[in-house]
């Protein structure tokens, strides 16, 4: 006999990297039938929900009007269909970014370079932070963590076609808040396109995610939300 | 189609209670929020409270806790709404309300005629 | 608590001319509920979560705004407009509804 139920879905709209003091909403999806909804936050009862009509609803949302370092977290829900609870969703890391400083990102040799050449990126930031991350826009972009006091170095090695791109990264003064984006770098690799198999597998980010971050920050506008879940975990894991 | 029957007015008298009703139709009575709001004559709406009737789980307004309670009668898919210690700040029109949640795609709210309750000796 | 402020209280408009109510909170909310009420009836659902006609509302009405400021426009007043229009804002749970005081848009 069934003594759980399969587990919700959980994502954040428009995107689970919120800038400070904006506002975000926390999507938990379970089954139609489902009479109540929990969210919890860093393994907490954080909030809780009641679909109405039931039968007609399998989604529930949570309001955050005004993301801070508070609020920034591990969230995860649950469902209920009469006494019978479900299984705990995964993990939703939600960042708050916008905090404190912008670093800059710079690319070595240089921004236009020839497939097979060795390129190194370099995120700096001046304040107290360790942790950096690279992100790369595009399908089967790309997400890195650096380490370093002031600056950390992404070596890509060999680079092939397969990596041009828009870069950006950030510095993480906690696993769920980080600053400001540096300004975008765009590399541009000339060579041989049959080297894009080469390509390194690296955890992906969702496409054109950058272009969804800047339009969440000027225009609330909401995305397509169906990767997110899958990102963060890869993210910050 | 869905309706939410009340009768029209009640008379009471000052220091008393009375028991509004809110017959509903046309629907899973347990499937959607009962609220109750309240208009005295020229003003705005004030809302009292809310019950689930699936479990009769209520929230209300803290102005009207102690005031008002609400209840359910599944049998009969009615809503019921008891105001007590009546006074003239209690003449007014109560209208019960039938809403599913805030983000639902196809929001329904639907509304009662009213009750035009008068407290007078 | 939430506190809805709707500005103007009382407005008069022109048959043919634009008319915009405002309906300010007292801190972010997500969704702007309005509702439409004639004298000696009940008041009727007219624009959900912000910018969505209720069934048999009239396209020159729309409805705008996030955060703390919303609003709800007539693109071109009709005499049948004339009514009372309430901003509410519909709290999920525990479940709580909360009205603006109310703006009268009178014909002239």
């Known amino acids: 006999q069934q003594q759980t139920l399969p587990k919700p879905f959980i994502w954040a709209e428009p995107h689970f990297m919120v800038p400070k003091e904006k506002q975000v909403t926390i999507c938990c999806q379970g089954n139609y039938g489902a009479v109540e909804y929990q969210l919890h936050f860093e393994g907490s009862l954080f909030a809780v929900d009641r679909p109405k009509p039931p039968e007609r609803i399998n989604k529930v949302q949570f309001y955050i009007p005004d993301m801070n370092s508070r609020m920034a977290g591990q969230y995860s829900c649950i469902y209920r269909v009469g006494e019978l609870w479900s299984e705990p969703s995964n993990l939703l890391d939600l960042v708050v970014t916008e905090m404190y400083d912008t670093p800059t990102l710079s690319v070595h040799p240089g921004p236009e370079v020839i497939s097979g050449e060795k390129v190194t990126f370099y995120c700096r930031l001046d304040t107290a932070t360790s942790m950096f991350l690279l992100l790369k826009e595009g399908r089967s972009s790309h997400v890195q963590r650096g380490y370093g006091k002031v600056q950390a170095e992404f070596p890509l090695g060999p680079v092939t076609t397969a990596h041009r791109g828009t870069y950006r990264c950030f510095g993480s003064y906690n696993n769920h808040a980080w600053s400001f984006p540096s300004e975008p770098v765009k590399l541009l690799v000339t060579g041989d396109i049959e080297n894009t198999s080469l390509a390194p597998e690296d955890p992906t980010f969702p496409a054109d995610t950058w272009g969804t971050y800047l339009l969440t920050t000027e225009t609330g506008l909401q995305k397509d939300h169906a990767l997110w879940d899958h990102t963060a975990q890869n993210l910050l894991r | 189609q869905v309706q939410l029957q009340q009768p029209g007015a009640e008379l009471v008298r000052p220091g008393t209670s009375v028991k509004l009703s809110c017959k509903a139709s046309?629907?899973?009575?347990?499937?959607?929020?009962m609220h109750w709001v309240k208009q005295r004559p020229g003003q705005g709406l004030e809302w009292i409270g809310v019950?689930?009737?699936?479990?009769?789980?209520?929230n209300y307004n803290q102005k009207f806790k102690g005031k008002a309670t609400l209840t359910v009668d599944t049998s009969s898919s009615t809503a019921y709404m008891q105001l007590s210690s009546l006074t003239s700040e209690d003449s007014a029109v109560y209208y019960c309300a039938r809403s599913s949640s805030a983000y639902y795609s196809n929001y329904e709210a639907y509304w009662g005629q009213g009750t035009l309750v008068t407290v007078s000796a | 608590q939430i506190v809805l402020t709707q500005s103007p209280a009382i407005m008069s408009a022109s048959p043919g001319e634009k008319v915009t109510i405002s309906c300010s909170a007292s801190s972010s909310v997500g969704y702007m509920f309005w509702y439409q009420q004639k004298p000696g009836s009940s008041p009727k659902p007219w624009i959900y979560r912000t910018s969505n006609l209720a069934s048999g509302v009239p396209a020159r009405f729309s409805g705008s705004g996030s955060g703390t400021s919303y609003s709800l426009t007539i693109s071109s007043m009709e005499a049948e407009d004339a009514a009372t229009y309430y901003c509410?804002?519909?709290?999920?749970?525990?479940?709580?509804?909360?009205f603006g005081g109310g703006t009268k848009l009178e014909i002239k």
């Open positions: 046309g629907y899973t009575f347990t499937s959607y929020w």
């Open positions: 509410q804002q519909y709290h999920s749970y525990p479940p709580m509804w909360t």
């Open positions: 019950i689930d009737p699936s479990d009769s789980y209520t």
